[in-house]
């Protein structure tokens, strides 16, 4: 058994069930028209 508060996650999507959003580091902010 384990009780953990985890560590900060910066990884992007890896496996099909990772649950992570893509979170691309190169995404640029673009105002909606």
């Amino acid at each position: 058994s384990e009780t953990t508060t985890g560590t900060s996650s910066n990884s992007s999507q890896s496996t099909s069930n990772s649950g992570l959003a893509p979170n691309p580091t190169n995404a640029t902010t673009k105002a909606a028209g």
Partner: antibody, heavy 117, light 113 residues
Amino acid sequence: QVQLQESGPGLVKPSQTLSLTCTVTGYSITSGYTWSWIRQPPGKGLEWIGYIQYTGSTRYNPSLKSRVTISRDTSKNQFSLKLSSVTAADTAVYYCARGTTASFDYWGQGTTVTVSS
Amino acid sequence: DIQMTQSPSSLSASVGDRVTITCRSSQSLLYSSDQKNYLTWYQQKPGKAPKLLISWASTLASGVPSRFSGSGSGTDFTLTISSLQPEDFATYYCQQYFIYPLTFGGGTKLEIK
């Protein structure tokens, strides 16, 4: 079938710490996905609080990061939310949900937390 | 943070009507690596948790009736209900599942006319 169930006190005093637990059945929280907390103030929209991934890593909404801790107890297949220094603005329905790579596909029924003295 | 804007905020319609709800994001949700739009739609009824309807802008979740459809790309998206049924009267939320922090639109409340 995957099911999530929130539990915890329905009333918390201002400045205290809100503590909620989500019990997951039908899937091991260490097998995959992210496990999130989301809240909804009365009559308002949804706000993502943060997640704990199956690996144990966490990520929090920067708007709440200084006050939030999400942890897990793998022996009970539960994950928990702690929100410190609460105010009336933290009054909301709190949901736990499973995150896939594209959506929240399973949700708990929600638990109402009122912050009041 | 990515801002999600839904319109209208409320809408009155009748059973059998065709209804369209729009959602606009402050940043493109199109991921160049897989050419998918990370836009999700949920339905919420009073006192209940949100229910997943559509992911990747247009992929219907399991068990969701085919009268629901999603479209759009980049920053502009729509949810369409082709023929409203009594059980469809609810609040609908869009969400970007692209960049953290994940954010939701303000919701569109669909009411009976």
